[in-house]
Amino acid sequence: AITEAREEAKPYPLFPGPFPGSLQTDHTPLLSLPHASGYQPALMFSPTQPGRPHTGNVAIPQVTSVESKPLPPLAFKHTVGHIILSEHKGVKFNCSISVPNIYQDTTISWWKDGKELLGAHHAITQFYPDDEVTAIIASFSITSVQRSDNGSYICKMKINNEEIVSDPIYIEVQGLPHFTKQPESMNVTRNTAFNLTCQAVGPPEPVNIFWVQNSSRVNEQPEKSPSVLTVPGLTEMAVFSCEAHNDKGLTVSKGVQINIKAIPSPPTEVSIRNSTAHSILISWVPGFDGYSPFRNCSIQVKEADPLSNGSVMIFNTSALPHLYQIKQLQALANYSIGVSCMNEIGWSAVSPWILASTTEGAPSVAPLNVTVFLNESSDNVDIRWMKPPTKQQDGELVGYRISHVWQSAGISKELLEEVGQNGSRARISVQVHNATCTVRIAAVTRGGVGPFSDPVKIFIPAHGWVDYAPSSTPAPGNADPVLII
C-alpha cells in the first residue's frame, strides 16, 4: 500500500468510532457544569442504506479498456451522513472511492460549508492499488472538536476535468450552552424598573434560562433563550447572573453589579490656587459621583467678616475641569468658600468650608474734589483733594501720584510726583509761565495705582499778572472740567 502521509498504511474502516484526543478548553465559560452522564460516544446517522445508488456527482469515464468494455461510473462510496458528538471529543470520518488505474494524479480535497480546507488540518489520503483499480480512502480527523467545527464536510476529486463530489457528512458539535448575550452592569434609579437580557445557544437546543439575583433564583420556572428579565426596581445594589441549561448541563454567566444612582458625595480638598484683589481661583476634588455623571457644580461664597450681613453669593459652573475663578470680589477681604456638585439625582452636600482672602488692589476710585490754585508769591501751584472712600481704596493707602502736564506754544511736558499718604495737599513748583497746567491725581496702594481724577486745568500767566481764583474738579454731572482764571 502506498500512503501519501507519513503514517503506517492501514486500511481504515468506513464508519469511524470514537477518536481519543487531548481535551482542550477553548471558549470555556466562566463556570461549566456538565451533566454527570459520563462518556458519550459520537452518534452517527447514515441517511442512505448501504448499496443504494449514490446521489453525489458521478463521472462517467470516456476511456474504454483494451477489450472495449466501458468503465463503470466513478462515485464516492456511501459513508456516515451525520455525526453528533460532544465538544472537545475527537472525531474521524472518511470518503472512499475506487478509481481505475488508467487515471494518474488523482487527489482528493476536503471542503467544509463550500470552502476548501487547506493547511493545518489532519487529512490523510491512503491508496490501495489492485490489478485494475486503486481504492482511495481519504480520512479527516479533528482531535478536539469545537463549535466552530460544526458544518457540512464533503470530498472532491477531479478526473478528466470532471469533478466528483461526495455526499455531505454533517458534524454537529454539542456542548454546554454558550452565551451570545450576557447581562451588563448598569446604574439605575431607585425603585425604577429596568430590563436585563440573557441569550445562550446550543447545540443541543433548547436552552433554558434561569435568573439569579443576589444568589436567589428569580424564576423557578425556566424561560427559553433569549430571556429578558424585568427587574421591578431596586433599593440597594444587587448582583445578577443568568444560568443557561441544556441537555449537556449548565453554564453560568458572569455576575453583574447593578448600582443605585444616588446624590453625589460632597467635593473634597477645596484649595486656593491663586488670589488677586478681586478674584480667587479655586480647585476641588470631586466626591463619589453616586453612579451618575456630574452635571454641574455650585460655588458658594460668603464674607467671613462677622459684621457682614451673611449673604451668600452663588456661582454655577460646569463640573469639569474642577476649577473656577470667583470674580467680582472685594479687595483685601476674607471669604468662606464651599463647593457642591450635582448629578441627575440631586445636589451633594457642601464641601468643608475654606477661608480665603483677596489681596490688596489698586484703588477703584480717584481722589475727590481736586482743587488747584496758583500761589504766585512762591511761584508754586497748590493742589488739594479728598481721599477716596475707604471701601474703594482696595487696600491701605501708601500715597498719591500727581500728574501735571505743562502745555505752552506747542510744547507739552508731563511730570509725575509721588506724595505720602498723610495729608491731602501738595505743592508743585511752576515749570513754565504763560502755559496751561493740567493736574490729575491717583491714589496708590501696595496693590497699584488707582484711576486718575478728571483733569483740572489752570493757566499760569507770564510774571506780573494779578492773583487768580483756584481751579477745581467739576461738580458731578458736568462734562468738562472748568478752568477758572
Partner: antibody
C-alpha cells in the same frame, strides 16, 4: 383573562385521601409555576410549595413533605393537590396560586375547603 | 426560615384615615409583596416587589422599605379597604407570609 378554578369543598374522615384540582385558563399553562397555599380556620397563609408546570417537578416545604403530592395534567391545564392519611389538623382552605418571577402569587383560585372530621 | 412579623395586628381606623402597616423580617430579604384578603375570599395581590402596584389596585395603596423593614400605606382609607393584609417575602426559600393585620372599623 387569567383564571384559576378549584374543585368544590370536601368532607373526609381521618385516614382518607383527598384530591383537589386547580384548572388554569387565560394563559399558557406551562409558562408559570403553580403554588399551593394553606389557610387553617382563622389562621394566616402558609406556603406549601409549588410545581414546575414545564417539567412537572414538585417542590415541597418542610412542613408538607410526605403526605402531600402535587401533580399536573398539562393536557387539560390542571394542577392537583393530593393529601393522604388525612388528619383533623389538615382541615383548611387550600388555594392554588399562579407563581411568577420574584415569588409573586399574582392570581389565586377561589380556594377549596377540606374538612377532616370523624 | 425567615420570620415575618406584622404590626399592628388589629388596628382600628376610620374612613379617610391614613394607615400604615409594618412588616419586619428576621433577616434581610430582597422584596416584600402585600396581599389583601376579605372574609370568605381568596387573597388578592396588592403590591409586588416592595413598591409596585398590582394591576387594578387603587393608587391610595403604596409600599416602601428595604432590608428588614417594609411598610404598606393606605393614604385615605375607603370602606372597601377593611380587610386582612398579609406581607410575603422573596429572597430566601421557603417564601413566608406574615401573620396578617386585620384592619377594623373604629
Amino acid at each position: 383573562q387569567v383564571q384559576l378554578v378549584q374543585s368544590g369543598s370536601e368532607l373526609k374522615k381521618p385516614g382518607a385521601s383527598v384530591k383537589v384540582s386547580c384548572k388554569a385558563s387565560g394563559y399558557i399553562f406551562t409558562t408559570y409555576g403553580l403554588s399551593w397555599v394553606r389557610q387553617a380556620p382563622g389562621q394566616g397563609l402558609e406556603w406549601m410549595g409549588w410545581i414546575n408546570t414545564y417539567s412537572g417537578v414538585p417542590t415541597y416545604t418542610d412542613d408538607f413533605k410526605g403526605r402531600f403530592v402535587f401533580s399536573l395534567d398539562t393536557n387539560v391545564s390542571t394542577a392537583y393537590l393530593q393529601i393522604s392519611s388525612l388528619k383533623a389538623e389538615d382541615t383548611a382552605v387550600y388555594y392554588c396560586a399562579r407563581y411568577t418571577n420574584y415569588g409573586v402569587f399574582d392570581y389565586w383560585g377561589q380556594g377549596t375547603l377540606v374538612t377532616v372530621s370523624s | 426560615d425567615i420570620q415575618l412579623t406584622q404590626s399592628p395586628s388589629f388596628p382600628s381606623a376610620s374612613v379617610g384615615d391614613r394607615v400604615t402597616i409594618t412588616c419586619r423580617a428576621s433577616s434581610s430579604v430582597g422584596y416584600m409583596h402585600w396581599y389583601q384578603q376579605k372574609p370568605g375570599k381568596a387573597p388578592k395581590l396588592l403590591i409586588y416587589a416592595t413598591s409596585n402596584l398590582a394591576q387594578g389596585v387603587p393608587s391610595r395603596f403604596s409600599g416602601s422599605g428595604s432590608g428588614t423593614e417594609f411598610t404598606l400605606t393606605i393614604s385615605s382609607l375607603q370602606p372597601e379597604d377593611f380587610a386582612t393584609y398579609y406581607c410575603q417575602q422573596w429572597g430566601s426559600l421557603p417564601f413566608t407570609f406574615g401573620q396578617g393585620t386585620k384592619l377594623e372599623i373604629k
